[in-house]
Every structure is written in structure tokens, then in C-alpha cells.
């Protein structure tokens, strides 16, 4: 259930290189960018996934209210710094010693700064609201069946399990994912919320992770649901620290 | 831990008829119940599923329309079945996945009876 | 996604083997399982994630496979191996109609 030994590929992460020369010959894989070996029975961490996609060439590609924390990832691409275990590390700095604090997701939380910048801690993402508008339909879509589609996707593709997902909210043609998981909850193996929500918003743009599955097909009871805009809120355990000067 | 099936019975065709799954000592919010039964002498046949956190449910296509599972409580789930005919005669198994993101059955109760006949 | 198991009857002496087969309708990411039943009783999983044997039971019983192939191997049979054995894909519960296979009776003489 690891990387797939007949042709060494990696089922959940197409942005490596695989080859059998793991224990006893088994097939590895390595991220691209990081070089580090990853588990692909399970989704890879954001932070990797971004790192490598910063080596690949460059042509590879009841509403609820967002809180006043919750923090949109409008810096888009930047090449992290990862830890050993593939996380992002809490504070990121470009070439030119610009540096700034990050969320367990990799999105800034704080001013930029220089290189004193202190980031004691990585803050954890615990609250992701995904909101998608969808392209008009003939009907609205059974709210449940929507539901209980989008729950299924999580588990199914993403291996995300169902009590992370909150809630689905629908309100035609809005559509609103809220995934919840606190320090205390995730246990070990669990994927987390901020690599799931990554593979999802990669899968709704049509540049599937995936190796080899086809790209994302979702349907309710049958009808296409098809996304024309994604937003994504994260909010974090602990509120973000921006100045004033930014929130004018 | 274990799960046991109650509700099992002979009925006549056309009839409907509910089964209760009673779950002790786990939580039932960190895993999904599926439904399967066994007709005597047959094999396995998957009925449905229930994601107790949240409640969504899933059914094999043979069983849309005519099976409905609902958590009931915070220790039960029910199987409803209407317009029952002879070949709905069968064991009826509830089991619980192992808590991960498969469907991997690793609590079975015991089993219960239904007979359909006049 | 349908599952297909052979054969449906195998008989073996004590300390033989027996091998299952199990195909998969499409790629079920060897998100797979084996179960053991015995008559009266309910079905005991054996093997998960195509080839990981649950706790407790003997190293005798083999999983294999990946993609749509699948298949359980029992060697050094004993008698209290004589059951009913079923695959059951565990990777989704949309669209199918089984998510099991045929089952297949082993007799062991």
C-alpha cells in the first residue's frame, strides 16, 4: 500500500522519483525539490508539494461568515522551507532576507520582516473553510446528496476521515466545506486538513497530484458538479498578527 | 466492544420491517456501520453504509429506494426495509470499519434472522 | 466496482496449500481485505490493505497483490482452516453492487 512495485510510481504523488531501492529492493519515492523520501500511501504535505513544485519548470500547473481572523493565501507560490518531517517551518524567508511567520499550511500570519523576525512556534490550522461557487445547473442539487458526496470524496480520495469534515453549507450555487481538526484530535496516520484541502483546491484547478487516477470526476446522483471559483479561509489556533497599517 | 443486531423476524411479503445495530463500549462518532447480510447457504452481499459523524449514508445500487439507515441514537444505528419479498430472506450483520479511512470490517454482531414468507 | 473471486470450492489435505484469487472490476489501490466464516458464525477479518494480517492471526495466511489482482494464500492447512473465505474491496461505497467477492469454501481432507 506503499509506492506501487509493479512500475514504482507514487499512487498519491506524481511530483516524484521513484526507484527500487528501498529495503529488500521495495520501490521509494523522493519528492522533487526536497529529495525527501515520501509515504505514498498517504497524501504528502503541503509543504513538499509546494517545494516541488517550485523546482518543476515553470509550465507545470446556511453560509457561514469567514471570522475576522481568517487568513486568505493571497502571497499564492513561494519555494518553504520544510522540517524533517515535511512541515512547514514557522518562519519562511526569501532571497532577500524578507522573512515572515507561517501557519501550519504555510499561509503568512504575520508582517513581513527582515531577519530577526522571531516565530516561536508553528500555529496549527484548525479550521478550513473551502467555498466554491458552482457553474449553473439545470436545478439546484439535493442538498444531502451533495453532502454526503463531498464527505465521501474526502474519506475516499483524500483519505481524509468524515469527523474532520464539519459541515457541507449549500446555498445555490455557493457551496461551503468547513474541515475542523484540533491539536488533540489528530491522531497519528491522520491526514491532515491543510494537505487535503491542498490536494482539493489542486484537483478543482484540473492539476490532479494523483498519478495514474484520472483527474477529478464529481458527480451528484449522476449530475457533474462543476466549480467555477474557489476560495479558501484558514484559521488558525491562535489569531494572526498583523499591523494595522495592513488592514486599512 | 461490540455491536449486536436486534429486530429480526418472519414476516409476510410486502411487509416492511426495521433492524436495530447496538453499539457498546466505542464511540460510534470515529467510525462508519455497514449493513450485509447472507441469504442460507449464499454469500456475503454489502447493503449500505452509515458515516455516523455526520450521518451520511451509501448504498450498493441494488438496495437505493427500498433500504434506509439512520442513527437513531448515540448507540444505534436502524436498517428500515420495505416491500420485503422471499429473497430478502437472510442474516443481516451490522459491522464496524476499523476506524480509518477504509472499509475495513474488523466488529461484527452476531447476526440477525429475517424470514419473508406467507 | 464488482469483485470476482476463484474458485468457488478448493479441497486440500492438512498441510497443503490453497491459493484465492480475488479481480477487482477496476483499481481498487490494494485497498483489499480477506474474511474468514465459519458456519453460525460472523465473518473474521484476516488480512487488510491487501497483504497486512490482523493481530492474532497465523503468519500461514498470505496476502498478495495490487491494482485489480488480488489473492490469499494458505499454507500448511490445518483443519481448523476449513471455513468459508471472502475478499472484499475496501476502498469505496459509491456506485457498486457488491463489495464482496463470491466467497470460496475450502475443504480441507
Known amino acids: 500500500h506503499t509506492a506501487a512495485q509493479d512500475n514504482c510510481t507514487c499512487p498519491t504523488n506524481k511530483m516524484t522519483v521513484c526507484s527500487p531501492d528501498g529495503p529488500g529492493g521495495r520501490c521509494q519515492c523522493r519528492a522533487l525539490g526536497s529529495g525527501m523520501a515520501v509515504d505514498c500511501s498517504t497524501l504528502t504535505s503541503k509543504c513538499l508539494l509546494l517545494k516541488a513544485r517550485m523546482s518543476a519548470p515553470k509550465n507545470a500547473r446556511t453560509l457561514v461568515r469567514p471570522s475576522e481572523h481568517a487568513l486568505v493565501d493571497n502571497d499564492g507560490l513561494y519555494d518553504p522551507d520544510c522540517d524533517p518531517e515535511g512541515r512547514f517551518k514557522a518562519r519562511q524567508c526569501n532571497q532577500t532576507s524578507v522573512c515572515w511567520c507561517v501557519n501550519s499550511v504555510g499561509v503568512r500570519r504575520t508582517d513581513k520582516g527582515d531577519l530577526s523576525l522571531r516565530c516561536d512556534e508553528l500555529v496549527r490550522t484548525h479550521h478550513i473553510l473551502i467555498d466554491l461557487r458552482h457553474r449553473p445547473t439545470a436545478g439546484a442539487f439535493n442538498h444531502s446528496d451533495l453532502d454526503a458526496e463531498l464527505r465521501r470524496l474526502f474519506r475516499e480520495r483524500y483519505r481524509l476521515h468524515p469527523k474532520f469534515v464539519a459541515a457541507v453549507h449549500y446555498e445555490q450555487p455557493t457551496i461551503q466545506i468547513e474541515l475542523r481538526q484540533n491539536t488533540s484530535q489528530k491522531a497519528a496516520g491522520d491526514v491532515d486538513i491543510g494537505d487535503a484541502a491542498y490536494y482539493f483546491e489542486r484537483d478543482i484547478k484540473g492539476e490532479s497530484l494523483f498519478q495514474g487516477r484520472g483527474g477529478l470526476d464529481l458527480r451528484v446522483r449522476g449530475e457533474p458538479l462543476q466549480v467555477e471559483r474557489t476560495l479558501i479561509y484558514y484559521l488558525d489556533e491562535i489569531p494572526p498578527k498583523f499591523s494595522m497599517k495592513r488592514l486599512t | 466492544q461490540s455491536l449486536e443486531e436486534s429486530g429480526g423476524d418472519l414476516v409476510q411479503p410486502g411487509a416492511s420491517l426495521t433492524l436495530t445495530c447496538k453499539a457498546s463500549g466505542f464511540d460510534l462518532n470515529n467510525y462508519s456501520i455497514l449493513w450485509v447480510r447472507q441469504a442460507p447457504g449464499k454469500g456475503l452481499e454489502w447493503i449500505g453504509c452509515i458515516y455516523f459523524s455526520g450521518g451520511s449514508t451509501y448504498y450498493a445500487n441494488w438496495a437505493k429506494g427500498r433500504f434506509a439507515i439512520s442513527k437513531t441514537s448515540s448507540t444505534t444505528v436502524t436498517l428500515q426495509m420495505t416491500s420485503l419479498t422471499a429473497a430478502d430472506t437472510a442474516t443481516y450483520f451490522c459491522?464496524?470499519?476499523?476506524?480509518?479511512?477504509?472499509?475495513?470490517?474488523?466488529?461484527w454482531g452476531p447476526g440477525t434472522l429475517v424470514t419473508v414468507s406467507s | 466496482y464488482d469483485m470476482t473471486q476463484t474458485p468457488a470450492s478448493v479441497s486440500e489435505p492438512v498441510g497443503g496449500t490453497v491459493t484465492i484469487k480475488c479481480q477487482a472490476s477496476e483499481d481498487i489501490y490494494n485497498l483489499l481485505a480477506w474474511y474468514q466464516q465459519k458456519p453460525g458464525q460472523p465473518p473474521k477479518l484476516l488480512i487488510y490493505a491487501a497483504s497486512d494480517l490482523e493481530s492474532g492471526v497465523p503468519s500461514r495466511f498470505k496476502g498478495s497483490g495490487s491494482g485489480t489482482e488480488y489473492t490469499l494464500t494458505i499454507s500448511d492447512l490445518e483443519c481448523a482452516d476449513a471455513a468459508t473465505y471472502y475478499c472484499q474491496q475496501a476502498y469505496t461505497v459509491g456506485n457498486i453492487d457488491n463489495a464482496f467477492g463470491g466467497g470460496t469454501e475450502v475443504v480441507v481432507k
Open positions: 459491522a464496524r470499519d476499523d476506524g480509518t479511512t477504509s472499509y475495513y470490517l474488523n466488529l
